[in-house]
């Protein structure tokens, strides 16, 4: 169920994707990638206001205990939904491979 | 990827599945759902430290860029890594019926 | 195998614009780079741009700078390079590469001919 | 911009016989991880270019091993062990250290 798009908290406020540019020595890679050598990572960054892109039944019971025990339990949180892959080529023992990630970009995003 | 299992922050502070207690009432179904009448929600909850059990590549790429700018990148966000299914006995138009929802209670959890 | 697929030929007048795209065929761009490059009539090589995953900003050779636009539309696995204010000298056939950041560029375009001409 | 300068110019060949084409550079492509960023390609006559080599000496995927890069810093050879008609074109080298990306003006491989 992938609730209400509309920001109760303001535009740009609430979970979405954003976009960071890094270089590889930011990411802690240098040591292992040496190409791309800047990465634009997108992520999912933005807060889960009430229903706000509820991934599913958990985050509305999330919101719903949150908002009773508001200490004990946090508001659901802004992740992936999904990915886009990136190719990376990396040093190996041998010389050098090419792989794909299929896990480093968030593609969009929901609250859970 | 699954990461470090050990929590700098002492037990118990990091990412682990929790269980809250709830009734109807607090969960918001009390006008659909016949039963049961009480759920023991299963929830993660708890701090996501650097590589505390990252769920991939870009819970790790998450923890660098919010160790370099904390202010615009978040750290991860403990979430569920799978689900337990629930039947409810729920309302419907023509009276009752059994529904299994497989995304109601988290089963456990990782940082992302 | 994926294969990138050029559209056609273009005759431009100068001061015009164009369009050149380059679909990836049997697959997507999969999280490969798009670079383009030119080659004008018995010339070499000349880069003029790339974009990276996820598409978002591209990253131009100063000497196109504010006269090419790089994008890609990753739910048609299509990637662009426009080229504006265009003269003769940008006669040549334009080709759009897939890669790892700039280099390893393995897969090839079979090349656009723009041909600017008044 | 890095300035990119191949000889010869031209290289009649003899099938069977070695071959040997020099890049050099204006400024050391070497990377402090201690890869040099440069790539060779292949341009057959009415063709698109065709990676051989990259990050120096990496051949590429499906590459004949009669081909081989060797090199570093700011001085780059290709060498084809033993020429085949098929290897006739025009041969590129590429720096990818720093943008803009630039070529060499090529080496044109015929047949004696």
């Known amino acids: 169920a992938r609730n209400g798009d509309h920001c109760p908290l303001g535009p740009g406020r609430c979970c979405r994707l954003h976009t960071v540019r890094a270089s590889l020595e930011d990411l802690g890679w240098a040591d292992w990638v040496l190409s791309p050598r800047e990465v634009q990572v997108t992520m999912c960054i933005g807060a889960c206001p009430s229903q706000f892109r509820a991934a599913n039944m958990h985050a509305q019971i999330k919101t719903s205990l949150h908002r009773l025990k508001p200490d004990t339990v946090p508001a659901p949180c802004c992740v992936p939904a999904s990915y886009n892959p990136m190719v990376l080529i990396q040093k190996t023992d041998t010389g050098v491979s090419l792989q794909t990630y299929d896990d480093l970009l968030a593609k969009d995003c929901h609250c859970i | 990827a699954r990461n470090g299992d050990h929590c700098p922050l002492g037990p118990g502070r990091c990412c682990r599945l929790h269980t809250v207690r709830a009734s109807l009432e607090d969960l918001g179904w009390a006008d659909w759902v016949l039963s049961p009448r009480e759920v023991q929600v299963t929830m993660c909850i708890g701090a996501c430290p650097s590589q505390f059990r990252a769920a991939n590549m870009h819970a790790q790429i998450k923890t660098s860029l919010h160790r370099l700018k904390p202010d615009t990148v978040p750290a991860p966000c403990c979430v569920p890594a799978s689900y337990n299914p629930m039947v409810l006995i729920q309302k419907t138009d023509t009276g009752v019926s059994l529904q299994t929802y497989d995304d109601l209670l988290a089963k456990d959890c990782h940082c992302i | 195998q994926v294969q990138l697929v050029q559209s056609g030929a273009e005759v431009k007048k100068p001061g015009s614009s164009v369009k050149v795209s380059c679909k990836a065929s049997g697959g997507t761009f999969q999280g490969y780079a798009i670079s383009w490059a030119r080659q004008a009539p018995g010339q070499g090589l000349e880069w003029m741009g790339g974009i990276i995953p996820p598409y978002a900003t591209a990253n131009y050779a100063q000497k196109f700078q504010g006269r090419v636009t790089i994008t890609a539309d990753e739910s048609t696995s299509t990637a662009y390079m426009e080229l504006s204010s265009l003269r003769s000298e940008d006669t040549a056939v334009y080709y759009c590469?897939?890669?790892?950041?700039?280099?390893?560029?393995?897969?090839w375009g079979q090349g656009t001919m723009v041909t600017v001409s008044s | 911009d890095i300035v990119m300068t191949q000889s010869p110019l031209s290289l009649p060949v003899t099938p069977g016989e070695p071959a040997s084409i020099s890049c050099r550079s204006s400024q050391s492509l070497l990377h402090s991880n201690g890869y040099n960023y440069l790539d060779w390609y292949l341009q057959k006559p009415g063709q698109s270019p065709q990676l051989l080599i990259y990050l120096g000496s990496n051949r590429a995927s499906g590459v004949p091993d009669r081909f081989s890069g060797s090199g570093s810093g700011t001085d780059f050879t290709l060498k084809i062990s033993r020429v085949e008609a098929e290897d006739v074109g025009v041969y590129y080298c590429m720096q990818a250290l720093q943008t803009p990306i630039t070529f060499g003006g090529g080496t044109k491989v015929e047949i004696k």
């Open positions: 590469a897939r890669g790892v950041g700039e280099l390893h560029l393995d897969v």
